[in-house]
């Protein structure tokens, strides 16, 4: 691996001083170091109009090394270039500059998107969401007895979230109101409301629903028989038929 | 579009010379360090010289040192590979390449073949 | 010299199957690694530089890893095209030193 040639002639150099400091295996008054200690990289700066030469452990900021046989040597990244493997390739962008297959550019390609943590042109990531769950049974309150109206929920996961320039995540629930043939709760499934009621001697035919968290404002408090109820249900269903034809569900969405 | 083109390849007898010659284009050729690297029929990668960017140095593979010598023409974009005493072993596709920690540009490989 | 191990010398894939390939080094060269591909009847292409870095024109099915001793090129999904010799090579000082080589091939 010896070189053919041997470095330039010092004779260039009448002051060259073998009494050098920082590393310089060899330097003059003009140029500073010519040469360096064994293991030290070699970088020319430019001062002004001069260059001088300085040694070092590595090789500085826009700089890359080169360890050849008889000299490890720094040579300078292109100028918009902070870190670079050589001169074609660079691995990290200067402030501004967004760094897409080894080369520095200010603004990213088509079909890429600025990663403002990396200063990297990437892909666009779009989200990604499974199918839907199976609808849930059919609740009010938490309970799944003792109402004819309640609500239906399903939901999906989010297999990929998108990045700042993918589309938007849907949503990863959806409600809809559910009609079911009513039963009564059992005496353990009863729950405070029940017990309320019976505290307060209402109607013993009353069968009125607990009221739902989506869509009343609390405890229906009017008293009606029977037969007012069943009529009062009819006209409901009427009308949520009706509205189910416009609109298929109400959906209550999550977005992630 | 970057075009490194070797000429000068062929049959030689052993002990005889031949100086290969590669034509760049493409990059500015003065700014690199080129190398020779070449492939025997069937086998690997091997490095063979660098000259550095200005002609001022050289280095060379242990098999090929006091035989061959590597030259350059910054004025022709040319890279020279001067190959001497040949030996049978030397037969090779001999590429010429920019050579910058890697080889990122490659000629096509011109062949030489040592017999008798 | 530095001395490079690579592993498989050859190794025969399946359209669509995941391939790697391992290059062991025998010192320690940071990231000062690269790989290349080179087809039958072509001069070898640079295809990843810096250990990881995907060279312009390469496909993200390719990727490489590693640094300081252990290095390795994998390809995701093996295509019609990438039936070819693959060799690693350490940019770490001089002389610069190949890896043997690995002969990918189509089953």
């Known amino acids: 691996q010896n070189a053919s040639r041997g470095r330039r002639q010092r004779r260039m150099h009448p002051n060259v001083s073998q009494g050098c400091q920082g590393g310089c295996a060899t330097c003059s008054d003009y140029n500073g170091c010519l040469s360096c200690k064994p293991r030290l990289f070699f970088v020319l700066e430019r001062i002004g109009m001069k260059q001088i030469g300085v040694c070092l452990s590595s090789c500085p900021s826009g700089y890359y090394g080169t360890r050849y046989p008889d000299i490890n040597k720094c040579t300078k990244c292109k100028v918009d270039c902070d870190t670079c493997f050589n001169k074609n390739f660079c691995t990290k962008c200067k402030s501004g500059f967004y760094l897409h297959l080894g080369k520095c550019l200010d603004s990213c390609p088509e079909g890429l998107e600025a990663n403002n943590h990396t200063m990297e042109c990437v892909s666009i990531v779009h989200c990604e969401a499974s199918e839907w769950s199976p609808w849930s049974p059919c609740m009010k309150k938490g309970k799944t007895c003792g109402f004819k109206r309640g609500t239906e929920t399903r939901v999906r996961d989010i297999l990929q979230h998108p990045s700042a320039k993918g589309n938007l995540c849907p949503p990863t629930s959806e409600t809809r109101t559910c009609i079911v043939q009513r039963k009564k709760c059992s005496k353990g499934e009863r729950g405070k409301k029940g017990r309320e009621r019976k505290r307060k001697k209402l109607n013993k035919e009353e069968r009125k629903e607990t009221s739902s968290s989506s869509d009343s404002k609390g405890l229906e408090s009017s008293i009606e028989t029977p037969d007012q109820q069943e009529n009062k249900e009819r006209q409901q269903q009427q009308k949520r038929r009706a509205r189910d034809k416009q609109q298929k569900s109400v959906s209550v969405s999550t977005v992630h | 579009e970057v075009q490194l083109v070797e000429s000068g390849g062929g049959l030689v007898q052993p002990g005889r010379s031949l100086k290969l010659s590669c034509a760049a284009s493409?990059?500015?050729?003065?700014?690199?360090?080129m190398a020779w690297v070449r492939q025997a029929p069937k086998k690997g990668l091997e490095w063979v010289a660098t000259?550095?960017?200005?002609?001022?140095?050289?280095y060379f593979g242990d098999s090929v040192r006091g035989r061959f010598t590597v030259s350059r023409d910054n004025t022709k974009s040319t890279l020279y590979l001067q190959m001497d005493s040949l030996r049978s072993e030397d037969t090779a596709t001999y590429y010429c390449?920019?050579?910058?920690?890697?080889?990122?540009?490659w000629g096509q490989g011109v062949m030489v073949t040592v017999s008798s | 010299d530095i001395q490079m191990t690579q592993s498989p010398a050859s190794l025969s894939a399946s359209l669509g199957e995941t391939v790697s390939i391992e290059c062991l080094v025998s010192?320690?060269?940071?990231?000062?690694f690269v790989w290349y591909q080179q087809k039958s009847g072509k001069s070898p292409q640079l295809l990843i530089y810096?250990?990881?870095r995907l060279q312009d024109g390469v496909p993200s099915r390719f990727s490489g890893s590693g640094s300081g001793t252990r290095f390795s090129l994998r390809i995701s999904g093996m295509q019609p095209e990438d039936e070819a010799e693959y060799f690693c090579?350490?940019?770490?000082?001089?002389?610069?030193?190949f890896g043997a080589g690995t002969k990918l091939e189509l089953k």
């Open positions: 390449t920019a050579h910058d920690r890697s080889f990122d540009y």
């Open positions: 493409g990059f500015t050729f003065s700014d690199y360090d």
């Open positions: 000259i550095i960017y200005d002609g001022s140095r050289a």
């Open positions: 010192e320690d060269i940071s990231n000062d």
């Open positions: 810096a250990a990881s």
């Open positions: 090579q350490q940019s770490y000082k001089y002389p610069p030193t």
